[in-house]
């Protein structure tokens, strides 16, 4: 039959950051190609990445339709050069992915400090709100739009002249902190979703930004 020499995919893995979501699998194909299907628990299967020789498939367009849904994907293996024939009744070998709920499982991307502004002994630090491919009413949503107050940022800040750090939190994208006048400070932020109880509740730390460099403003 036409599928006897094909090998089922294995190690199906979801790779997702800020809702950009790719399904990866093995093995690298030898004389075979793959087609991916995705569905919600209650929905119909939708085919993507038809007869691809890749071992990944970008499923972002599907999962952003409802990031709170739970998705399942499966990868079918076909002989290389396979052409869909209406007469074929034999189901090709396939493997199911783990379930994936984007809202709960997408990794938080590394945040970026957009700006900081000093007025006297106060500094306002603003975290850049990342855009996602999630849409509502034909408008792309930011990370804050999607997560609301479920998303918090932790700010680490310290005097440029010392290593002793302080920290503050916000469930917006802005911090207003007290600083010593005449001192330069450095800042780094980390995104956290406190309600998550899984191993992806924190982002990596942002790059460090320091006063006296281009992102900042100082006003007396």
């Amino acid at each position: 039959s036409g599928t006897t020499n094909t090998v089922a995919a294995y190690n199906l893995t979801w790779k997702s950051t800020n809702f950009k979501t790719i399904l990866e699998w093995e093995p690298k194909p030898i004389n075979q190609v793959y087609t991916v299907q995705i569905s919600t628990k209650s929905g119909d299967w939708k085919s993507k990445c038809f007869y691809t020789a890749d071992t990944e498939c970008d499923l972002t367009d599907e999962i952003v339709k409802d990031v709170k849904q739970t998705y399942l994907a499966r990868v079918f293996s076909y002989p290389a050069g396979h052409v869909e024939s209406t007469g074929s009744t034999e189901e090709p070998p396939y493997e199911n992915s783990p379930e994936f709920t984007p809202y709960l499982e997408t990794n938080l991307g590394q945040p970026t400090i957009q700006s900081f502004e000093q007025v006297g002994t106060k500094v306002n630090v603003t975290v850049q709100d990342e855009w996602t491919l999630v849409r509502r009413n034909d408008t792309f949503l930011s990370l804050r739009d999607v997560f609301g107050k479920d998303l918090i940022y932790t700010l680490y800040y310290w005097k440029s002249s010392s290593s002793g750090k302080k920290t503050a939190k916000t469930n917006t994208n802005e911090f207003l902190i007290d600083v010593d006048k005449g001192e330069n400070y450095c800042f780094s932020v980390q995104a956290v979703i406190p309600s998550r109880r899984t191993a992806n509740r924190k982002s990596t730390d942002s790059p460090v930004e320091c006063m006296g460099h281009e992102k900042g403003e100082s006003r007396e």
């Epitope: 918090i152 680490y156 750090k165 503050a168 939190k169 902190i177 980390q190 109880r197 191993a199 730390d205």
Partner: antibody, heavy 117, light 107 residues
Framework: QIQLVQSGGEVKKPGASVRVSCKAS????????VYWVRQSPGKGLEWIGY????????IYDQNFKGKATLTVDKSTSTAYMELSSLRSEDTAVYFC??????????WGQGTTVTVSS | DIQMTQSPASLSASVGDRVTITCLAS??????LAWYLQKPGKSPQLLIY???NLADGVPSRFSGSGSGTDFSFTISSLQPEDFATYYC?????????FGQGTKLEIK
């Protein structure tokens, strides 16, 4: 289930150091900060500082800088607090706790450190 | 540093009473406030987080309210096991200070 198990009580002489351990289990250790809190006899709770096992960042209360040093061993999911130059006023119960960003949801059983000549 | 002023320092009440404890922050902390209970010789136990949210497994007779600088914690009907010391804590900015505690005693 989630547990934080601390090392046993210690009696130390003034000027000595002590290391208190806090072994975490039942959760992903690097995803939660570990806080340390002191409670002197008959007194309230004092925040010492915390360590983020994910990136090693430590934050201390000014009163404990130079007194407490926080470290972690990710391979054993254990947090440590070393207290140096002990004085009688360091006699207290020391707690570790898991930080869920909005609060401290699980606490160790406490370690009594007694400083006496 | 943010100071947390908790009152009263002690409180006598009877089983079935409604009691309220307040916590005042020296500057705004939005809703970054937690409440804990501690019994003698035991570790503190989380009751309320984010000012108003009940922690897992905590009975509904406990509640929290407030935001900004003024917060309160209420037990709607005291049970015998509720006699303990209660602490508020701000988790907005370091150092993450606690209130001085309120000792709730049987009248």
């Amino acid at each position: 289930q989630i547990q934080l198990v601390q090392s046993g009580g210690e009696v130390k002489k003034p000027g000595a150091s002590v290391r208190v351990s806090c072994k975490a289990s039942g959760y992903s250790f690097t995803d939660y900060n570990v806080y340390w809190v002191r409670q002197s006899p008959g007194k309230g709770l004092e925040w010492i500082g915390y360590i983020d096992p994910y990136n090693g960042i430590t934050i201390y209360d000014q009163n404990f800088k130079g007194k407490a040093t926080l470290t972690v061993d990710k391979s054993t999911s254990t947090a440590y607090m070393e207290l140096s130059s002990l004085r009688s006023e360091d006699t207290a119960v020391y707690f570790c706790a898991r930080d869920v960003t909005t609060a401290l949801d699980f606490w160790g059983q406490g370690t009594t450190v007694t400083v006496s000549s | 540093d943010i100071q947390m002023t908790q009152s009263p320092a002690s409180l006598s009440a009877s089983v079935g009473d409604r009691v309220t404890i307040t916590c005042l922050a020296s500057q705004t902390i939005d809703t970054w406030l937690a409440w804990y209970l501690q019994k003698p010789g035991k570790s503190p136990q989380l009751l309320i987080y984010a000012a108003t949210n009940l922690a897992d497994g905590v009975p509904s007779r406990f509640s929290g309210s407030g935001s900004g600088t003024d917060f309160s914690f209420t037990i709607s009907s005291l049970q015998p096991e509720d006699f303990a010391t209660y602490y508020c804590q701000q988790v907005y900015s370091s150092p993450f200070t606690f209130g001085q505690g309120t000792k709730l005693e049987i009248k």
